[in-house]
């Protein structure tokens, strides 16, 4: 099969490899204070950490990338840690006609992988 | 709107920002010579280059990540260049019963964005 088995144990030590981490941010941090009314403090789950060889490979392409990075590190970058899925988030915000509650599907990460 | 306009012109100079690049690889490079019969040389399109602020942002999450990276570079990584879509590739390979042609959907990148 084209898929080698992606690795799930981090060879770099705890917390070093690609994982989900919560970052607190205010509306001011995001430049959203002029249009978002609530929540005023956001808990943003983001993907952080390194992607050692075959760790949480997103797909065959990521496995190839990891292999070629080992052979040609100056030409081919290592896979990097990005969202594999997202959690919908509700924001209360201004609209032309008043205030609206709207769900955003691509705002907060729910899972991470190496792509 | 949650979406700032993603930027499409590279502020770092030609070829420096996230883009698609073709990398040639042999079956030996990939460790596939024992099961893939053809093609023996692959033209692998991969995503390479940097992701400066708001360049080709994949979505709102990527825009937030770029913004928070500017504020907390040690805590929040910059977005990175990953495939936004893939091109199907046909491989001729060995099977238990002989030889088969099979299409792989996640092997070669077709487009890139910053996630």
């Amino acid at each position: 099969s084209a898929h080698a088995h992606p690795r799930d144990s981090c060879p770099l030590g705890p917390g070093r490899c690609c994982h989900l981490e919560t970052v607190q941010a205010t509306l001011e941090d995001l430049g959203w204070s002029d249009w978002v009314l609530s929540p005023r403090q956001l808990q943003l789950s983001m993907c952080v950490g390194e992607c050692p060889h075959l760790y949480r490979s997103a797909n065959t392409h990521a496995q190839i990338k990891a292999r070629l990075h080992g052979l040609q590190p100056d030409k081919v970058p290592a896979p990097c840690c990005v969202p594999s899925s997202y959690t919908p988030v509700v924001l209360m915000h201004r609209t032309d006609s008043g205030v609206s509650l709207q769900t955003y599907d691509d705002l907060v990460a729910r899972g991470c992988h190496c792509a | 709107s949650a979406h700032a306009h993603p930027r499409d012109s590279c502020p770092l100079g030609p070829g420096r920002c996230c883009h698609l690049e073709t990398v040639q690889a042999t079956l030996e490079d990939l460790g596939w010579s024992d099961w893939v019969l053809s093609p023996r040389q692959l033209q692998l399109s991969m995503c390479v280059g940097e992701c400066p602020h708001l360049y080709r942002s994949a979505n709102t999450h990527a825009q937030i990540k770029a913004r928070l990276h500017g504020l907390q570079p040690d805590k929040v990584p910059a977005p990175c260049c990953v495939p936004s879509s893939y091109t199907p590739v046909v491989l001729m390979h060995r099977t238990d019963s002989g030889v088969s042609l099979q299409t792989y959907d996640d092997l070669v990148a077709r487009g890139c964005h910053c996630a």
Epitope: S38, P39, Q43, T87, P88, V89, V90, M92, V108 | -
Partner: antibody, heavy 119, light 112 residues
């Protein structure tokens, strides 16, 4: 339409821990933006906000109860829970779970459950 | 904590007539974004509270337009343009500017 349902013992002895669970149906507790909240109402009295938990597990509590309160979430069961330790008769109340956007807009409530603290 | 004070404590009303409830906060609820962080709730007899108004003047989904919220800073008013029999219950204001959110003591609306 999201529905919330409180469950737990209706009678708790003084000095013990009050434990309640709120089961969410018709929607995922994993949805961000919403704060899953506990509010109580003493008999014949007004409303008191106890605290809330966000889908990520971060919590915020009323300072007046903070030393005794723990709110947790079990996303696999689509539930969140309240524990209130060292209860006294003053903790006798109807306990409601509710869904809000941060500390406001509580547009979905459970039907409430009466908890009596008595020996 | 921000203290919320409601008046009157009890409000006898006649169906078809208007009604008005006052709410005062111990500090301004006006955020720098121009919105007042105040909600109004109605608790009908034997029921859970239900959201009527949020951010001072925005009617919640499904709330009849006879309900309106007004005011700014520390003084707020909930008006019912024409009271109906189903509007009886206890009305609460709640400040949402800062944690912990705090409720007023309630105003009991009953039919004369």
């Amino acid at each position: 339409q999201v529905q919330l349902q409180e469950s737990g013992p209706g009678l708790v002895k003084p000095s013990q821990t009050l434990s309640l669970t709120c089961t969410v149906s018709g929607g995922s507790i994993n949805s961000g933006g919403y704060y899953w909240t506990w509010i109580r109402q003493h008999p014949g009295k007004g409303l008191e906000w106890i605290g809330a938990i966000y889908y990520s597990g971060s919590t915020v509590y009323n300072p007046s109860l903070k030393s005794r309160v723990t709110i947790s979430v079990d996303t696999s069961k689509n539930q969140f829970s309240l524990k209130l330790s060292s209860v006294t008769a003053a903790d006798t109340a109807v306990y409601y779970c509710a869904r809000g956007v941060e500390y406001q807009h509580f547009n979905e409530w459970g039907q409430g459950t009466l908890v009596t603290v008595s020996s | 904590d921000i203290v919320m004070t409601q008046s009157p404590l009890s409000l006898p009303v006649t169906p078809g007539e208007p009604a008005s409830i006052s709410c005062r906060s111990s500090q301004s609820l006006l955020h720098s974004n121009g919105y007042n962080y105040l909600d109004w709730y109605l608790q009908k007899p034997g029921q859970s509270p239900q959201l009527l108004i949020y951010l001072g003047s925005n009617r919640a989904s499904g709330v009849p337009d006879r309900f309106s919220g007004s005011g700014s800073g520390t003084d707020f008013t909930l008006k019912i343009s024409r009271v109906e029999a189903e509007d009886v219950g206890v009305y609460y204001c709640m400040q949402t500017l800062e944690a912990p959110p705090t409720f007023g003591g309630g105003t009991k609306v009953e039919i004369k």
